[in-house]
Interface confidence: medium
């Protein structure tokens, strides 16, 4: 979380954003708010990103401002025109690129004053691992399959009988470029399993950190995955 | 198009003001800082400060404190530098500079100001 | 103040081939967030500077990728993979972690 005031004491408004994540040919949220002004006409939102010339969005007078908008971010960005109000100024980022990343300001400038505040964004692929008994292996053997990954994650498999144990002599991982050449499919095999434990699949890059659990028991298998994005801090 | 454009050349005696104007296009002025930038011929570069140009407060330099002014006119998107009590090495190009984050990343043309008798 | 020195002074170069320029400052350029304020410029002649690359290693927009920067604390590289015409001018390094923000005394490239 990263808090801003105005640099200016008498007119300085706090603004917070937190840091996040995009995923690559999805919609991504930059998250900004401020203290609500109570005439739309009065708020200002700029937002701006570091290594660029152009506005990434503007917004005044209740409505979009994008005369000064840079080309690589025509047409895919547009802010909450109805949270405004409330003091909500994020921005949608549609089609997330690889090249998003980096730092952005959010600018804010209501009749109380001004302030702004700085968001990392980073930008890649993360997907939720599935694990799965691999029946047509000669063994007793797991496959954790996730079909989106950028950049290169590591792939880690533990076990919840054997806490502590390396995996990494009994388990094989590879990574297959996708069609679009960017994001790559992991998949990892682990070898060897035993019955009535419970095997974990973290796969983890400096964006996400996923996990695929698979319980094998002799009367059942069951199967949880989750995702965490690893960078949302506030500021 | 983001640009700035600077005033011309000026020609001072010893001991008299110069003022200097940026005038910014292509962006929400009070957006970013506004620098300027001292160039000596055949000389490096020396910050001389710069100016809040949403508050209008200035930082200068230490070597500059004193004898700078710079002020700004958000009506005209235009940024001044005044520098007073003038001496020949003063003799140098001055450059407008947008601060994005922490780097300068427009600059002006530069303005050549020559101090001479 | 941070003195920033530059070295060399003056590099001929040939067409298509590399070169590097290297930067110092008399105290570490890490800033208590982490970030490290150095960033490079170039001056053609008879032209304003402009930002090449900043934060140490990141480049400008438009700026072409046989530019790259390196370092850490006081110590830092700015490298042209294979130089063309129009890299010919005055390179500065410059930094912004500490006010003043100082630059070097610049490197004049030059064709052979």
């Known amino acids: 979380l990263i808090i801003g005031f105005g640099i200016s004491g008498r007119h300085s408004i706090t603004v917070t954003t937190v840091a996040s994540a995009g995923n690559i040919g999805e919609d991504g949220i930059l998250s900004c708010t401020f203290e609500p002004d109570i005439k739309l006409s009065d708020i200002v939102i700029q937002w701006l990103k570091e290594g660029v010339i152009g506005l990434v969005h503007e917004f005044k007078e209740g409505k979009d401002e994008l005369s000064e908008q840079d080309e690589m971010f025509r047409g895919r960005t547009a802010v909450f025109a109805d949270q405004v109000i409330v003091g909500n100024a994020s921005l949608r980022l549609k089609n997330v690129q690889l090249t998003d990343a980096g730092t952005y300001k959010c600018y804010i400038i209501t009749s109380k004053g001004k302030g702004n505040a700085n968001l990392e964004y980073k930008t890649g692929a993360f997907s939720m691992p599935e694990v799965n008994v691999d029946y047509n292996a000669s063994s007793e053997t797991l496959r954790c399959e996730a079909p989106r990954w950028f950049p290169q994650p590591t792939v880690v498999w533990a076990s919840q009988v054997d806490q502590g144990a390396n995996f990494s002599e009994v388990s094989n991982t590879s990574f297959e470029l996708n069609s679009e050449n960017v994001t790559m499919k992991v998949v990892s095999v682990l070898y060897n399993v035993t019955i009535n434990n419970t095997y974990s699949c973290m796969i983890e890059n400096d964006i996400a950190k996923a996990t695929g659990d698979i319980k094998v028991t002799e009367s059942e298998i069951k199967r949880r995955s989750h995702l965490q994005l690893l960078n949302s801090k506030a500021s | 198009q983001v640009q700035l454009v600077q005033s011309g050349a000026e020609v001072k005696k010893p001991g008299a003001s110069v003022k200097v104007s940026c005038k910014a296009s292509?962006?929400?002025?009070?957006?970013?800082?506004m620098n300027w930038v001292k160039q000596a011929p055949g000389q490096g570069l020396e910050w001389m400060g710069w100016i809040d140009t949403y508050s209008g407060v200035p930082t200068y330099a230490d070597d500059f404190k004193g004898r700078v002014t710079m002020t700004r006119d958000t009506s005209i998107s235009t940024a001044y530098m005044e520098l007073s009590r003038l001496r020949s090495d003063d003799t140098a190009v001055y450059f407008c500079?947008?601060?994005?984050?922490?780097?300068?990343?427009?600059w002006g043309a530069g303005t050549t100001v020559t101090v001479s008798s | 103040d941070v003195v920033m020195t530059q070295s060399p002074l003056s590099l001929p170069v040939t067409l298509g081939q590399p070169a590097s320029i290297s930067c110092r400052s008399s105290?570490?350029?890490?800033?208590?967030?982490?970030?490290?304020?150095l960033h490079w410029y170039l001056q053609r002649p008879g032209q304003s500077p402009r930002l090449l690359i900043y934060?140490?290693?990141n480049r400008f927009s438009g700026v072409p990728d046989r530019f790259s920067g390196s370092g850490s604390g006081t110590d830092f590289t700015l490298k042209i993979s294979r130089v063309e015409a129009e890299d010919v001018g005055v390179y500065f390094c410059s930094q912004s972690t500490h006010v003043p923000w100082t630059f070097g005394g610049g490197t004049k490239v030059e064709i052979k």
């Open positions: 292509g962006y929400p002025f009070t957006t970013y800082g």
């Open positions: 500079a947008r601060r994005s984050f922490w780097y300068f990343d427009v």
């Open positions: 105290q570490s350029l890490v800033h208590s967030n982490a970030n490290t304020y």
């Open positions: 934060k140490v290693s």
